[in-house]
């Protein structure tokens, strides 16, 4: 009886099970009762990453420098090229089809997580006792200066954007 289902790495065609082509190869002709599936390796700059019956290989992704992209990992016959962004930029999506400049954290906010090629800067508000007085993609919130350890007193309270101002203690006469 002709099969209705086939084993793993096979496909059903013309009432018979044919072997799929291995990753890195494309289908030239289906199997017959006399011959196995005929497959051919993908060409230069092409790939197929699964067991398949595709008659055409996929083109490797192009990392367009005009979009801020560069090659992170060169493609093979079995894998696509992986793009990433130039320094200071990150991908706009998981597919990394274009890049945008890393976001800076405004004064009053510090960097919680520095941006990577695939993720943007994560900012956090500076909590009480910490400040950031610059717009930066790298700077964390800094702790207020401890006047006491310097044998000084707070002359002006700190904010999330400014450090405390220390001054000499008033001498009792």
């Amino acid at each position: 009886e002709p099969p209705t289902a086939c084993r793993e790495k096979q496909y059903l065609i013309n009432s018979q099970c044919c072997s799929l082509c291995q990753p890195g190869q494309k289908l030239v002709s289906d199997c017959t009762e006399f011959t196995e599936t005929e497959c051919l390796p993908c060409g230069e700059s092409e790939f197929l990453d699964t067991w398949n019956r595709e008659t055409h290989c996929h083109q490797h992704k192009y990392c367009d420098p005009n979009l801020g992209l560069r090659v992170q990992q060169k493609g093979t016959s079995e894998t696509d090229t992986i793009c990433t962004c130039e320094e200071g930029w990150h991908c706009t999506s998981e597919a990394c089809e274009s890049c945008v400049l890393h976001r800076s954290c405004s004064p009053g906010f510090g960097v919680k997580q520095i941006a990577t090629g695939v993720s943007d800067t994560i900012c956090e508000p500076c909590p009480v006792g910490f400040f950031s007085n610059v717009s930066s993609a790298f700077e964390k919130c800094h702790p207020w200066t401890s006047c006491e350890t310097k044998d000084l007193v707070v002359q002006q309270a700190g904010t999330n954007k400014t450090d405390v101002v220390c001054g000499p203690q008033d001498r009792l006469r």
């Epitope: 002709s29 199997c31 017959t32």
Partner: antibody, heavy 117, light 107 residues
Amino acid sequence: EVQLVESGGGVVQPGRSLRLSCAASGFTFSNYGMSWVRQAPGKGLEWVASISSGGDDTYYPDNVKGRCTISRDNSKNTLYLQMNSLRAEDTAVYYCTRAGGKAMDYWGQGTLVTVSS
Amino acid sequence: EIVLTQSPATLSLSPGERATLSCRASQSIRDNLHWYQQKPGQSPRLLINYASQSISGIPARFSGSGSGTDFTLTISSLEPEDFAVYYCQQFNSWPLTFGQGTKVEIK
């Protein structure tokens, strides 16, 4: 027991035609692809033609394409090879074979075709 | 067309010896290769399919190996009835082709 019995061979003049038959028994004929393979005297094996189990698909090498026709009658459990415009180089023993697991798993005893004037 | 080249053309050995027959394909055929044996005056018979898979009823002394372009048929210890001609055949693509054969003869 699987049996393949060829017939129809003999001496024939160049340019003439001949039809070979292969009577199959011992298996469900209509479930198997079939082929013809030939062997010139003292030489190796050469594939001549194949036909799918249903008879819809036929396959030939370039050197016999257009001169040979493979066919089958599943109701009679018989395989045929029609050979036209015969040449001296067609002289050979012609074997009928069954395709099992993409191999020629059973062979007939062969029938000798001699093309000579 | 895929060309199969068998070597040696003739192998002269004594009963009990090990026989190693080679079949080389002109391009990769994965494991899509069969081996056949033909004794004088007889029809060929299937020995090995898919390069290394044994066939029911064939003695265990016959084994096949290889993949891609290089294949080997090994007869571990020759019996008198093993002296014959051996053919490889590819079924990777049309046209189906056979090697020219290796004759294993008694030394």
